[in-house]
């Protein structure tokens, strides 16, 4: 008789990333008997929830159930019914909810309570919704990319899984940019740290890792823009803000109450003689860059070396994967290629920002104007953050790899979070079994 493959025992997991600007649901699958192997879990689906981030539902919590319906129903379709009850569901909320909690624990709790109630109505094994710490967000992002790059595997391969994988086991650093925060995580050369708050120790697959991580709350691209506007309106002579970070000819009215809604602008808050002001774009990269730099306080550092705002940062080491909004923005601007130097990126940004708004709208007719209008700022902000904030140089720029997916799985904290919560990253190297799940009988 012909050999027949044994049916694979497949497991699934769901993680919802409740970010500041939107929520995404990720479905992961893996062969059950290979749970402790490295690199076996992969993403089968991403479903982007329609609407803003959950923190924006504070005034309309009754709409949260409907908000989550489409993606949860999609999960119901993708995952075989027989697996529903044993499929764990986790929701992690990030900086948008950290900011809401900073303003009011009650409001943050209320949103999470309604989210939990909504997710409990599905046939999956709901494991809870919580606000993850900035440290966790950084650490899980680092775990995700290194897991997907095969950095934790002890087996050396003669082939490369992904373009930027080198055969050495040196881990990649992780650069994550969201709407409300940004994280930097890497293994520094020196094991000792001057700042215990930024130090993490892991033992993964039999190896010890001493990791540096920091999450800069309010330095995600959206909150950084609010900060910049709040800073610049302080010195405006009237209710018109001529802004170099927006294309020439661009105009937008901003409510002062919206500007001061977030704790991120608290340091710039002042009584203004108007309730609204108008942004008028002048599209000048250099001036925009200068304005962005004012958000980074580099004059004070209680350590041997700092990033900005007095936060310790050890010397950069090795290659870095830059994902989430780092990738989305740079990909839109067509600047993710390994061959594009930092000087070239700056040149392209100068050109892009100076293009008239009408021209930009015509060239990118399919892109929502709200997003389209902010790419000049976001691109400039990314350059400023990486170069002046994190101290990358024209030379070390080539060590930054803008990554969207690795082997079909999105780079981000969600996979690392699930691997940790399902105990799928063993501290010790698993003993290799003689037969794999695809053994023939």
């Amino acid at each position: 008789t012909q050999n027949k493959a044994l049916p694979e025992n497949i497991k699934y997991g769901i993680v919802l990333d409740a970010g500041s600007s939107h929520t995404s649901l990720y479905i992961y699958k893996w062969p059950a008997e290979k749970e402790n192997d490295t690199g076996v879990v992969h993403q089968v689906e991403e479903c982007r929830v329609k609407g803003p981030g959950i923190s924006k539902y504070v005034q309309k919590v009754n709409e949260i159930g409907i908000y989550l319906t489409d993606c949860m129903e999609r999960a119901r379709e993708v995952i075989p019914r027989s697996q529903h009850q044993e499929t764990p569901v986790y929701l992690g909320a990030t900086a948008g909810m950290r900011l809401l909690r900073m303003e009011s624990e009650e409001l943050a709790d209320r949103v999470l309570d309604v989210v939990e109630r909504s997710l409990s109505n599905y046939p999956f094994d709901f494991q809870g919704a919580r606000i993850i710490t900035g440290q966790e967000e950084g650490a899980y992002g680092w775990i995700t990319i290194n897991y997907l790059l095969g950095k934790f595997s002890q087996k050396t391969r003669w082939f490369s899984i992904v373009p930027y994988e080198t055969n050495n086991q040196e881990t990649f650093g992780a650069l994550d940019l969201g709407g409300a925060s940004t994280q930097i995580t890497f293994v520094p050369q020196n094991q000792t740290t001057e700042s215990p708050d930024n130090a993490l120790q892991f033992r993964l697959y039999g190896k010890d890792y001493n990791v540096y991580t920091h999450s800069f709350l309010c330095y995600g691209k959206d909150q950084a823009l609010w900060q910049k506007l709040a800073k610049d309106i302080q010195v405006a002579s009237n209710e018109i803000l001529r802004d170099p970070c927006f294309h020439p000819g661009y105009k937008k009215v901003v409510n002062v109450s919206d500007l001061y809604k977030t704790p991120c602008t608290k340091r710039f808050e002042m009584t203004l003689p108007f309730q609204q002001f108008e942004i008028q774009g002048i599209g000048n990269y250099q001036q925009c860059h200068q304005s962005v730099l004012e958000l980074f306080n580099t004059s004070y550092c209680p350590y041997s070396q700092c990033a900005f705002n007095g936060i310790f940062l050890p010397p950069l080491q090795g290659d870095f994967g830059a994902f989430s909004a780092f990738y989305f923005v740079m990909n839109f601007l067509n600047l993710t290629s390994e061959k594009v130097s930092q000087e070239k990126v700056t040149e392209m940004m100068k050109k892009f920002c100076s293009q008239p708004w009408e021209e930009i709208k015509t060239s990118y007719a399919g892109v929502k104007e709200k997003y389209l209008s902010e790419y000049c700022f976001s691109g400039t902000y990314i350059l400023s953050l990486l170069l002046q904030g994190y101290h990358f140089t024209a030379d070390s720029w080539e060590h930054i790899h803008f990554i969207g997916k690795i082997q079909g799985s999105d780079a981000g904290w969600t996979l690392g979070y699930m691997l940790n919560l399902t105990n799928m990253i063993p501290a010790e190297q698993p003993l290799s079994t003689p037969l794999s799940h695809s053994t023939y009988v």
Partner: antibody, heavy 116, light 111 residues
Framework: QVQLVQSGAEVKKPGASVKVSCKAS????????MHWVRQAPGQRLEWIGY????????TFNQKFKGRATITVDTSASTAYMELSSLRSEDTAVYYC?????????WGQGTLVTVSS | DIVMTQSPDSLAVSLGERATINCKAS??????????MYWFQQKPGQPPKLLIY???NQGSGVPDRFSGSGSGTDFTLTISSLQAEDVAVYYC?????????FGGGTKVEIK
């Protein structure tokens, strides 16, 4: 576990200034606001103001505006409240409390006595 | 400013009996479906301890005999069965609007 430890008691002359410190531990200092509340002998609790440790922005009770200053040293996870132009009615126990709107954790209190 | 008026000023209750304290706000302290109302217990020489948040939720480690109710402007703290260790001053507080304000306090004693 969350802890807020305040500096020791102070005796000040009228017209002088006092600076009280509050050292936080057991949580990410920049994730929560820090409030200051005082209680004069036999009186109700009185809210002074708060700071956003993340960026140093602060909000005050109008009654203390111009006289109270709240600052932070994030590297030391410490908040400070300075009250200037002291008068005898400022004699009170001064507390720091962590929270957005929920004051779940309080310092042990610092007695400030204003006397000539 | 929102004025918080507590009643009574003091209260003497027998051990094991129910104690009820009221707090009235000069305007509603509700927002987005949440009551920004809190109850604290303070013993001599100690900082206040959070008992109730959001009008009716128990603070962590707070015994079940403490409960809160109410919404809008009228709120109540109830101690279902008074224990000797409950002798203290109780304060209500609102954080709906700056300046955050406290009630004048209610002294609870054993009868």
């Amino acid at each position: 576990q969350v802890q807020l430890v305040q500096s020791g008691a102070e005796v000040k002359k009228p017209g002088a200034s006092v600076k009280v410190s509050c050292k936080a531990s057991g949580y990410t200092f920049t994730d929560y606001n820090m409030h200051w509340v005082r209680q004069a002998p036999g009186q109700r609790l009185e809210w002074i103001g708060y700071i956003v440790p993340l960026n140093g922005g602060s909000t005050f009770n109008q009654k203390f505006k111009g006289r109270a200053t709240i600052t932070v040293d994030t590297s030391a996870s410490t908040a400070y409240m300075e009250l200037s132009s002291l008068r005898s009615e400022d004699t009170a126990v001064y507390y720091c409390a962590r929270g957005g709107t929920r004051f779940a954790y309080w310092g042990q209190g610092t007695l400030v006595t204003v006397s000539s | 400013d929102i004025v918080m008026t507590q009643s009574p000023d003091s209260l003497a209750v027998s051990l094991g009996e129910r104690a009820t304290i009221n707090c009235k706000a000069s305007e509603s302290v509700d927002n987005f479906g949440v009551s920004f109302m809190y109850w604290f217990q303070q013993k001599p020489g100690q900082p206040p301890k959070l008992l109730i948040y959001g009008a009716s939720n128990q603070g962590s480690g707070v015994p079940d005999r403490f409960s809160g109710s109410g919404s809008g402007t009228d709120f109540t703290l109830t101690i279902s069965s008074l224990q000797a260790e409950d002798v203290a001053v109780y304060y209500c507080q609102q954080t709906k609007e700056v300046p955050y304000t406290f009630g004048g306090g209610t002294k609870v004693e054993i009868k």
